[in-house]
Interface confidence: low
């Protein structure tokens, strides 16, 4: 660049037929220098008798321009285009509050027009993230926030999130949301969201990955319903009844808490013991009756059977022939006869 170059530009122009002011068909666009690769700035204006670049308020030397001109067949106006190359050294040599900038200035007989300023910046991407995501353990259906502030860079880094090395697309999976400040929100954590999450920052210079944050979606255990009470375990006297439940509704997962409380409940129970019946002693034989028999009896009441105890086994009444007493005949001996 050369301060004296301005004197090479014409101060007045011939009185040509009136022309419109130049307008830019293409204006220079902001550019980034990556490592030591120079950038080209380009612009095109019509009508234009001259076109030059000015960088940081100083004219760029004529020899540093590559200029091309042609006549637009439709309008008959001169179209001029120009490009310059900006090196990293030139950008580094500029000090002050404002970034390195260039703009195009085009002349026609009607006057001059300036393009917008195109800023040229040295591109970089720092290595360290300003904030990296931290691993979390969350319960099912809980909202999860993973924070990421990318490394400082020019141009500003774009951010994407990886779930186990796959790019997260919030359009495809509505359960994910990426905020304007690059944080990842899992709206309602699902078991399938248990994964390693990585924040990726990239610009034209480099791509950087944050440390990986492991999200574990856990499920706390829940009890099943109680079973029915069992029968009393003692057939006679004091015992207990029990009922059970299991931690399977749902079962704990990914380190979720086991169910709190008892899996077994017992209550005391008493079963009445069975009493088997026993015979009373036989009664005395009755006097011999007219039919030449007499009898005796006993009862199943000593004690009587209770609570499902066994009944007495055997005869209640016993009889046998006799010849004394009121017997009117002599009868031969006979076997006992049981009367029920």
């Amino acid at each position: 660049q050369d301060d004296d170059f301005f004197h090479e530009l014409p101060e007045t122009f011939p009185s040509d037929p009136p022309e419109p002011l130049p307008h830019f068909l293409i204006e220079p666009e902001e550019a980034y220098i990556v490592k030591n690769k120079p950038v080209n700035l380009y612009c095109k204006a019509s009508p234009a008798t001259q076109i030059y670049f000015k960088c940081n308020s100083e004219w760029v030397h004529q020899k540093d321009h590559i200029v091309d001109e042609r006549v637009d067949e439709t309008s008959g106006l001169i179209v001029r285009e120009v490009s310059i190359e900006i090196s990293r050294q030139q950008v580094e040599e500029l000090f002050g509050p404002e970034d390195y900038w260039c703009q195009c200035v085009a002349w026609s007989s009607a006057g001059t027009t300036k393009s917008r300023k195109a800023y040229v910046r040295i591109a970089y991407l720092r290595k360290t993230f300003e904030q990296e995501p931290l691993g979390k353990e969350v319960s099912l259906e809980q909202e999860v926030l993973l924070q990421c502030r990318p490394p400082e860079g020019i141009p500003v880094a774009e951010v994407e999130w990886l779930k186990n090395e796959d790019i997260i697309d919030p359009v495809e999976d509505r359960n994910f949301y990426i905020t304007i400040d690059h944080n990842l929100i899992i709206k309602q954590a699902r078991l399938s969201d248990t994964a390693n999450y990585t924040c990726v920052a990239k610009n034209i210079v480099a791509k950087r990955k944050s440390t990986t944050a492991t999200v574990i979606v856990y499920v706390n255990g829940g009890w099943s319903t109680w079973t029915e009470w069992s029968v009393c375990n003692s057939r006679c006297g004091r015992g207990y009844q029990k009922r059970t439940r299991t931690c399977t509704n749902p079962a704990p997962l990914n380190g979720g808490a086991f169910c709190e409380g008892q899996s077994v409940q017992k209550i005391a129970c008493t079963t009445l013991c069975p009493v088997d019946g026993r015979w009373t002693p036989w009664s005395k034989w009755s006097t011999c009756g007219t039919e030449c028999t007499h009898w005796r009896r006993r009862e199943c009441t000593a004690p009587a059977p209770k609570n499902g105890g066994k009944d007495c086994d055997g005869l209640v009444l016993q009889s046998k022939n006799c010849t004394d007493g009121l017997c009117m005949q002599t009868a031969p001996d006979s076997d006992d006869v049981a009367l029920y």
Partner: antibody, heavy 116, light 111 residues
Framework: QVQLQQSGGGLVKPGGSLRLSCAAS????????MSWIRQAPGKGLEWVSY????????NYADSVKGRFTISRDNAKNSLYLQMNSLRAEDTAVYYC?????????WGQGTMVTVSS | NFMLTQPHSVSESPGKTVTISCTGS????????VQWYQQRPGSAPTTVIY?????PSGVPDRFSGSIDSSSNSASLTISGLKTEDEADYYC??????????FGGGTKVTVL
């Protein structure tokens, strides 16, 4: 042959001043940034200042800012370092060098001793 | 403040290879160029590598420079070491204020 010839070093008392000069030859002086670098005895290199080709821009190390002034005279192909309020810790060999970022040609160095 | 850290010294036999590292304290060392200077005892420094890996004419191709973004460091490698390579070597870059920053220097001894 590209050369940088230095002069102006010497012994000076603390609080005193000194002006170093660097005469360039063998290249178009006005095309290049120029720098001053110093090296204390037994120590490493320390950048002091640089100046742009047209003197529009200068930059200084924090340790010398406000005390040292870099300047150049393109007509005389010369670079200067005006050092004021000198301190004992400014004792060093001072080198002039061509370039502001990568220094590709260096002067032979001149010794500046600040001592009472 | 941005700093460049070098090992204090390295030594190796003639014909062998030495590598000197230069690690940036912050930011990305790849964001700016790194230069390497050789300074023999009693002499002014000379450039052996500029712009990360470029060799000035006259510097043998035994000298090479590289940048490793992952470790945020630059390296100077001297292969086929010769006794004339015995010197102090300094790396240099710039900080965010465009101040020139030198490493502390590494003494290379040829055994």
């Amino acid at each position: 042959q590209v050369q940088l010839q230095q002069s102006g070093g010497g012994l000076v008392k603390p609080g005193g001043s000194l002006r170093l000069s660097c005469a360039a030859s063998g290249f178009t002086f006005s095309d290049y940034y120029m720098s001053w670098i110093r090296q204390a005895p037994g120590k490493g290199l320390e950048w002091v200042s640089y100046i742009s080709s047209s003197s529009s821009y200068t930059n200084y190390a924090d340790s010398v800012k406000g005390r040292f002034t870099i300047s150049r005279d393109n007509a005389k192909n010369s670079l200067y370092l005006q050092m004021n309020s000198l301190r004992a810790e400014d004792t060093a060999v001072y080198y002039c060098a061509r370039g502001g970022g990568g220094m590709d040609v260096w002067g032979q160095g001149t010794m500046v001793t600040v001592s009472s | 403040n941005f700093m460049l850290t070098q090992p204090h010294s390295v030594s190796e036999s003639p014909g062998k290879t030495v590598t000197i590292s230069c690690t940036g304290s912050s930011g990305s060392i790849a964001s700016n160029y790194v230069q390497w200077y050789q300074q023999r005892p009693g002499s002014a420094p000379t450039t052996v590598i500029y712009e990360d890996n470029q060799r000035p004419s006259g510097v043998p191709d035994r000298f090479s420079g590289s940048i490793d973004s992952s470790s945020n460091s630059a390296s100077l490698t001297i292969s086929g070491l010769k006794t004339e390579d015995e010197a102090d070597y300094y790396c240099q870059s710039y900080d965010s204020s465009n101040h020139v920053v030198f490493g502390g220097g590494t003494k290379v001894t040829v055994l």
